[in-house]
Interface confidence: low
């Protein structure tokens, strides 16, 4: 007797891993045989299609390598013309050992970065993923983490953090590793011993010494009143990433040797500076009784800060005085580093007006020095954290050299513009034409007690004090 | 005369994207970082992200993390902030800020630490169906 | 994430008063902190930065100050422009976090 189809054997969630073979079964009873068909998706699958193979009057679908685009809902349906056709449907699931689709690269980078080794994976369950570094386990801290994509991110990259790193994927299937990538950390140009400065006798030998470090090992050049040394010779160790050079020198004028450590970074280079003095004993230069003269400004330094055409008093102490004192400017301000955009252009003011002293010709040029009014409001209202770190450092003795000495005055020995108004010059780049500016804070204040004035880039204002201000 | 103007803003639906732009003039683009920061009404300042102008790293705040986007264009002293995926709670004037950074031993340093000095007017966005 | 703290939420005050906000960090954040003054439909104005600098152009009787990680704005002698909603920021790490702001009313 005819007899409608019936499935005795539904279809089941069916796990498969990439390229083995997966079988549905759909066992039919029927009369007349059926016509059994498959779909995947709700699409017909083609009896042609060479991916499947179909057995067993339909009732068996094989799918011969499974692929990953595989995954979904099979069903085969079951029809003889007596009653209705009937349909069973299973899931196929595609389990896929872990697989490392972008795996990580060596990657350079500066320390205090952001470094990002990339690892992607695939797989079925989703893999986690970890790092080892060179043989161990990699930690995660709040600089070092693992991201949701598998990738490392270590912030504010460390010396320490250099190595080798693999990632390692992990499901229930199985572990797949990378391949090991290197992690260079480069490190700017530092010197670690800056050359001290020293008082000599004419004739005399000395040696100059600057220790410098930095990823990859900077090379050192030296600087002699800013040209490259002529004469001397220098001596070069190499050892655990610090250079230590040596430069001996026959002393016959006083000069300003400027050491200066570079690496290259890709493309850019990154240099670090330092300098020292060499001064002789009783030194005067020849044809003249005096310690210095006068001379219109033409160095770039200070352009934008002196007076336009200022005469300034040029320091005979020096082979070379403009070059020197110019030279002088630059490592100050080098040496002073970072400071805040209210304190910038009132120290630009204060060191190069201290260097390069205004000028009084006559039958002995004489430098005039700045007012001690000038030196505290930069000092005490500018300035004042900045002051404080290079005062501190200088207790500490972290300048190896005398620089910051001779480029920053000492307020307090400074004369007042009370004393004699003539005896002093004015900053021209400070205007204070605050109308409620009526005292400067006092010497133990750490912050200002009145505005902070604006810094106008003109160089033609002038400071404008009347002479009932109070200075303490 | 330093300036900050925002644009872009307005009102979008849940799900849909906005750019804002912010055009500075009057100081430095590129030594400065660029910060949008938002304001709910009746709520207080809630920062968004910012961007190194120089460097061009960036950083945002959780809260719209993977959704919204900052970027600068230096050659036009501009910054942009991309904003998909849009919620009712993104809903707020947003404001574009700038602060000081330096370069100092080869990076850029600062961003923040010398405060937002300069402001934008701030450009008003609407999330609602 | 750095939490800043901010008290008291609001206070009311009298012209030539001596006002106290403080704000405390969660975690270290050095000096990076900077504070902030609103009034209604405007942008905020940058009062302090670096916890104690006076920004420029910004009246004397506004001052900061860090003891670890606790920061003061103090106003020495309130005028009556300076009702307003203050807020406090810091940097220290990538991410920006602002108080929730006081609002200094007339008593």
């Known amino acids: 007797l005819p007899k409608a189809p019936v499935i005795t054997t539904p279809l089941e969630t069916v796990d498969a891993l990439v390229e083995e073979v997966a079988t549905f079964m759909c066992a039919v009873e029927s009369y007349p045989q059926p016509e059994i068909s498959w779909t995947r998706n709700k699409i017909l699958i083609k009896l042609f299609d060479t991916r499947y193979s179909i057995r067993e009057n339909g009732q068996l679908l094989t799918i011969l390598s499974v692929e990953d685009s595989d995954d979904g809902i099979y069903c085969c349906t079951a029809n003889n013309g007596v009653g209705g056709a009937v349909e069973s449907c299973g899931a196929l699931q595609v389990k896929m050992k872990p697989k490392i689709t972008r795996p990580p690269i060596n990657v350079k980078i500066i320390e205090g970065l952001k470094a990002v080794l990339p690892c992607t994976t695939m797989g079925n369950p989703k893999p986690s993923v970890s790092w080892i570094k060179g043989d161990s386990p990699l930690r995660e801290n709040s600089r070092i983490a693992v991201l949701e994509s598998g990738s490392l991110r270590i912030h504010n990259v460390q010396k320490e953090d250099a190595g080798q790193y693999r990632c390692v994927a992990k499901n229930s299937l199985g572990t797949a590793y990378s391949k090991v990538v290197k992690l260079e950390v480069e490190v700017f140009a530092r010197i670690l011993r800056a050359p001290e400065s020293h008082n000599v006798t004419f004739g005399s030998f000395v040696t100059l010494h600057c220790t410098a470090t930095g990823i990859p090992v900077p090379t050192i050049t030296w600087i002699e009143n800013g040209n490259a040394v002529s004469s001397g010779s220098i001596q070069e160790s190499v050892k655990d990433r610090v250079i230590d050079s040596r430069l001996q020198l026959f002393i016959t004028k006083p000069g300003l040797y400027t050491c200066i450590a570079t690496n290259k970074h890709g493309e850019k280079f990154s240099t670090a500076k330092a300098a020292a003095t060499i001064s002789i004993a009783e030194w005067s230069k020849p044809q003249k009784d005096n310690k210095g003269y006068c001379a219109q400004y033409r160095g770039e330094v200070c352009n934008a800060v002196l007076a336009k055409d200022a005469l300034v008093f040029l320091n005979t102490s020096y082979a070379d005085p403009e070059e020197a004192q110019e030279l002088l400017v630059h490592t100050a301000w080098n040496e002073l580093k970072v400071v805040s955009p209210v304190c910038r252009p009132a120290a630009e003011a204060l060191l190069c007006n201290h260097i390069f002293q205004e000028c009084s010709p006559g039958v002995v040029p004489t430098p005039i020095p700045i007012c001690r009014e000038y030196c505290l409001a930069v000092k005490e209202l500018f300035c004042a954290k900045e002051w404080l770190v290079m005062e501190e450092k200088t207790h500490r003795g972290l300048y190896r050299s005398e620089m910051h000495l001779l480029s920053v005055p000492e307020c307090s020995k400074l004369p007042s513009m009370h004393w004699d108004p003539t005896a002093c010059a004015r900053l021209p780049h400070l205007d204070y034409n605050k109308e409620n500016l009526k005292t400067f804070p006092p010497m133990t204040s750490s912050k200002p007690s009145v505005d902070i004035p604006n810094l106008p880039s003109s160089s033609s204002s002038s400071f404008s004090v009347s002479p009932t201000y109070s200075m303490t | 005369e330093v300036q900050l103007v925002e644009s872009g803003g307005g009102l979008v639906q849940p799900g849909g994207s906005l750019r804002l732009s912010c055009a500075a003039s009057?100081?430095?683009?590129?030594?400065?970082?660029i910060h949008w920061v938002r304001q709910a009404p009746g709520k207080g300042l809630e920062w968004v992200a910012s961007?190194?102008?120089?460097?061009?790293?960036?950083s945002y705040a959780d809260s719209v993390k993977g959704r919204f986007t900052i970027s600068a264009d230096t050659s036009k002293n501009t910054a942009y902030l991309q904003m998909n995926s849009l919620r009712a709670e993104d809903t707020a004037v947003y404001y574009c800020a700038r602060s000081y950074t330096m370069f100092y031993y080869g990076g850029w340093y600062g961003s923040g630490y010398f405060g937002m000095d300069y402001w934008g007017q701030g450009t008003l966005v609407t999330v609602s169906s | 994430d750095i939490q800043m703290t901010q008290s008291p939420s609001s206070l009311s005050a009298s012209v030539g008063d001596r006002v106290t906000i403080t704000c405390r960090a969660s975690q270290s954040v050095s000096s990076a902190v900077a504070w902030y003054q609103q009034k209604p439909g405007k942008a905020p104005k940058l009062l302090i930065y670096s916890a104690s600098s006076l920004y420029s152009g910004v009246p004397s009787r506004f001052s900061g100050s860090r003891s670890g990680t606790d920061f003061t704005l103090t106003i020495s002698s309130l005028q009556p422009e300076d009702f307003a909603t203050y807020y406090c920021q810091q940097s220290s790490s990538s991410l920006i976090t602002f108080g929730q702001g006081t609002k200094v009313e007339i008593k």
């Open positions: 961007i190194s102008s120089s460097s061009g790293s960036t």
């Open positions: 009057g100081f430095t683009f590129y030594s400065s970082s």
